[in-house]
């Protein structure tokens, strides 16, 4: 259901967490949202600028029977073969009723650095 | 709730520098880009710039590279705009505003007139 | 860089007449990403701050009266009052953010 412009209640239950590790580490970062009625498309961010090829897997789970019921939403960011070009902060983001939602940040970085 | 707030006014002299403050409350600073807008008396609206403040990475409208600097602080979660060797041309109302991805809600501070004069 | 043109650059009207504005882009908007036209509405009322009416080319900002349309694709783009009040009076500007941000030279709407 569209949410008005001031009530920013963000509909992100669990947000990407943290991965450091070697070059060449495989890893993945997951984002968590329920909301009411259709699942939107979750965009995955790095430092702010939307992932054009990002390598994400998304699945949706009825809380109910009925189509505008609750449903769980779950992206998963998976980070192959890890780079400095990969390090920075990432969000999930959605585009929901009249608002955009961000999720909290996590953060990738390289050991050693 | 979402809140840019801008000075009201600045009065410099010309050939100064001058820093224009927005501080931001009412979200998570460090995820969405702020942008810089300019507006002189009966003119249109331009683009200046943006700061992503969680990395401070920057985006310039090449007309103001030599004359604008975008900086943040994260700790009073603040923006900054500075201007070097200002001019009559740089008299004009500065606005910032929160980028929104392309979407909504969007959130304008009230702008600040900044006057260069003598 | 992106330019976009706006016209006309004033036009006065009564109120209850229909008024269309354009936009013109010099590239296409849309994201084949996020499947979003990236062209927003504004309106700017004298000594206020601009004020969002419609973004992604045709979506209504929550709380603008349903007088404003948006249309548009590809390059091209329209606004639309359908009954124009007294309270419309403002200057309306596009903008994109498809690259950054660029704004349209803007729209007066005068009130005869």
């Known amino acids: 259901a569209p949410r008005g412009t001031q009530a920013e209640e963000s509909p992100f239950v669990g947000n990407p967490g943290n991965i450091t590790g070697a070059r060449g580490l495989t890893g993945t970062l997951r984002c968590q949202l329920q909301v009411q009625g259709e699942p939107p498309e979750v965009h995955w961010l790095r430092d702010g600028q939307i992932l054009e090829l990002a390598d994400s897997t998304q699945t949706q789970v009825p809380l109910g029977e009925d189509e505008q019921d609750d449903w769980i939403v779950v992206s998963q960011l998976r980070i192959t073969s890890l780079q400095l070009s990969d390090t920075g902060q990432y969000q999930c983001l959605v585009f929901l009723g009249h608002q955009t939602f961000v999720s909290q940040p996590g953060y990738v970085g390289l050991e050693g650095l | 709730q979402v809140q840019l707030q801008q000075p009201g006014a600045e009065l410099v002299k010309p050939g100064a520098s001058v820093k224009l403050s927005c501080k931001a409350s009412?979200?998570?600073?460090?995820?969405?880009?702020i942008n810089w807008v300019k507006q002189r008396p009966g003119q249109g609206l331009e683009w200046i710039g943006n700061?992503?403040?969680?990395?401070?990475?920057?985006n310039y409208n090449e007309k103001f590279k030599s004359k604008a600097t975008l900086t943040v602080d994260k700790s009073s979660t603040t923006a900054y705009i500075q201007f070097s060797s200002l001019t009559s041309e740089d008299s004009a109302v500065y606005y910032c505003t929160r980028d929104t991805y392309g979407g909504s809600p969007d959130y304008w501070g009230q702008g600040t007139t900044l006057t260069v004069s003598s | 860089d992106i330019v976009m043109s706006q016209s006309p650059s004033s036009l006065a009207v009564s109120a209850g007449e229909k008024v269309t504005m354009s936009c013109k882009s010099s590239?296409?908007?849309?994201?084949?990403?996020?499947?979003?036209?990236?062209l927003a509405w504004y309106q700017q009322k004298p000594g206020q701050s601009p004020k969002l009416l419609i973004y992604w080319a045709s979506t209504r900002q929550s709380g603008v009266p349903d007088r404003f349309t948006g249309s548009g694709s590809g390059t091209d783009f329209t606004l639309t009052i359908s009954s124009v009040q007294a309270e419309d009076l403002a200057v309306y500007y596009c903008k994109q953010s498809y690259n950054l941000w660029t704004f349209g030279g803007g729209t007066k709407l005068e009130i005869k």
């Open positions: 009412g979200y998570t600073f460090t995820s969405y880009w």
């Open positions: 590239q296409s908007l849309l994201n084949s990403r996020t499947r979003k036209i990236y």
């Open positions: 700061i992503y403040p969680d990395s401070s990475s920057t």
